[in-house]
Structures are given as structure tokens and as C-alpha cells.
């Protein structure tokens, strides 16, 4: 369930663009970064996919947005919301946020100036 967020620029346009792209590779890439070879991600079905491929696919998907720079924050917020319930503790939430904010740099995009990743009523 998507909640309403304040965004820079045309929010409905960004929402449509974020809805169109597949954010799963980004979610999987970040979970793999954080958890690596640990058993917790067995059910996540990413052992079969090379970690570098997930990173590349993530960047490719984000690049599919017509205005990647302007809609980046919306995409990061959506990833956070999608994964919030999977994050087991406060430390993991912080690590996930740190990785999310680093995603534009990993993909060689400009980072959003401000992006509030507090979602799900403060749970994340």
C-alpha cells in the first residue's frame, strides 16, 4: 500500500514513474549488501542471482524513470516502504537507510538534496 508523500516537482508524475519501474532488484541488492552470505536471506531467493547483476539491474531500472534525478527520492521512499517489514531491528533499519541514500552514487546519478526515508508511521 502506497502512502501519500510530499515530493519535489510533479508528485503524480513521479508516482506514475516509480510505479512503472521494477524496484525489486534494488531491494534485493541492498538486502544482499547488508546480509551477504548469512542464512537470513535464504528465503529471499537471491543466491542464484549474481550480486553485481542485481546492482546493475537496479541502476538500469532507476534510469528508466523519465526524470531520474527529480523522482529519485520517491523511488528510495518506495523501496524503504516495501522492505520495512523485513528489517529485523533498529540497526538493520539504519543500515538499510544508509545503503539507500548511497544508491544514487553507486549508480552514478546525482543524489536528491533532501529525502525523508521515515516511512510506515515511524516503524522505519
Amino acid at each position: 500500500m502506497r502512502r501519500e508523500r510530499g515530493r519535489q516537482g510533479d508528485s503524480s508524475s513521479c508516482e506514475r514513474q516509480v510505479d512503472r519501474v521494477n524496484l525489486k532488484p534494488c531491494e534485493q541488492h541492498i538486502m544482499q549488501r547488508i546480509m551477504g552470505e548469512q542464512e537470513q536471506y535464504d528465503s529471499y531467493d537471491i543466491r542464484s542471482t549474481r550480486s553485481s547483476d542485481q546492482q546493475q539491474r537496479c541502476c538500469d531500472e532507476l534510469n528508466e524513470m523519465e526524470n531520474t534525478q527529480r523522482c529519485m527520492c520517491e523511488a528510495l521512499q518506495q523501496i524503504m516502504e516495501n522492505q520495512c517489514d523485513r528489517l529485523q531491528d533498529r540497526q538493520m533499519v539504519q543500515q538499510f537507510k544508509r545503503e539507500l541514500m548511497n544508491l544514487p552514487q553507486q549508480c552514478n546519478f546525482r543524489a536528491p538534496q533532501r529525502c525523508d526515508l521515515d516511512v510506515s508511521g515511524g516503524r522505519c
Epitope: 549474481r50 546492482q55 543500515q95
Partner: antibody
Framework: QLQLQESGPGLVKPSETLSLTCTVS??????????WSWIRQPPGKGLEWIGS???????YSNPSLKSRVTMSVDTPKRQFSLRLSSVTAADTAVYYC??????????????WGQGTRVTVSS | EIVLTQSPATLSLSPGERATLSCRAS??????LAWYQQRPGQAPRLLIY???KRATDTPARFSGSGSGTDFNLTIASLEPEDFAVYYC?????????FGGGTKVEIK
Amino acid sequence: QLQLQESGPGLVKPSETLSLTCTVSDASIDTPSYFWSWIRQPPGKGLEWIGSIYYTGNKYSNPSLKSRVTMSVDTPKRQFSLRLSSVTAADTAVYYCARYVDYVWLRAFDIWGQGTRVTVSS
Amino acid sequence: EIVLTQSPATLSLSPGERATLSCRASPSAGRFLAWYQQRPGQAPRLLIYDASKRATDTPARFSGSGSGTDFNLTIASLEPEDFAVYYCQHRSNWPLTFGGGTKVEIK
């Protein structure tokens, strides 16, 4: 300018455990996209990747060494460590610590320590 | 695991000559290949990443090319300080591997 410095004993007895520490200066160890790594070079031979560890504790090791390798990271101290158990003369090498950058557009060891020579001998 | 084979093992050339070093990946390494230079008694240093991009401080005489399975490092005109050992390294997936190295020596 970020620098890496290896430290540890230069001589280890066969069957014992080799322990090395790398200290990171002028950078935080918990920066995303950086894997803190160990590489070794036996005398007169090429480079061999030992393993890499992320600030979260996520680690990857060379399959040929994995059963003997333990890596850890101490974020507040800006240090990461390597332990290699049951050493033999074949583990005699110069051991380097290095930073591995893992971006989509840059995947490489961009910063290296000067290396520390470890000899396994009784 | 990707195996990297470098050739030749040794390259004997004179200053001013052109050097071409080869690195073959099996299976494919995509474009995720880096080249390092190691001078005697020193740690390796990054020269080229992403197969063809020069690292900071890498002189323009060094260039990288290739993708997939075949990669080359070219030194357009050898300077005295270029006589060293060169290693390729991949990262299309873990584990990371290095090639066996090519020594560029003075003829």
C-alpha cells in the same frame, strides 16, 4: 587522504594462527559501497585475494582459504582484522589490506596498504 | 569462479616502445575488469577500472580496452618507471580473482 596500515607479527609458527589488523586513517569504515579486503603475495608470485568484509559484517572469502579465514570489523576503532588458522610455510607472503570500491561504474581496489611480510617458520 | 589468464608472462621492450598486455577471462567478466601496476618492493596501484577508464593519476599513455573475455592494457610509449608487473582483476561476481601477471622488463 585515506591511508591503510597493516600490523601484526612478522613470524608465525606452523599450525598456529596468523593475526593481522588494518587501521584506516581519515575515513569512516562504515561507509556504504566499500569492502575492506585482504590480499596476499607469496615471494616471487602473483596476487591472491583472501577475502573482503563489509561494515555490516557481510563477508566474502576465497573458496580455497574459506575454512581457515576469519574476518572482523571494528567500526569505532576504524580497524578490520584477518585471522588465518593452521598456517603452513605456503602461507608465507606479503599481506596487503585494501579498500574495494563496489559501484556499478567502479569495481576495484583503489587504495592499498604498504603490506606486511609474514613468515611461517618454526 | 572466473579464471584470468595473462599473456605474455614476460614482455621485453625498450623505453619508447609500445606495450600490449593481454588478459583473457573464462567465463566472461563483462566489462568489470581492472588493471594494476606493481613496481618492485611496492604495493600494487590501480591503473584502469571498468576495462577502459583511467584511475586518478594514471598517465594518458596507459589505455585499457575489451569486454567479455578479451581485454588489453596498452602502454603507448614506455617510460623508465613503467617497467613493472601488471595484474588484471575481475569483479563480475564473488570471488574476486587476479590474473597471474605480466612482467614488463627492459630489453
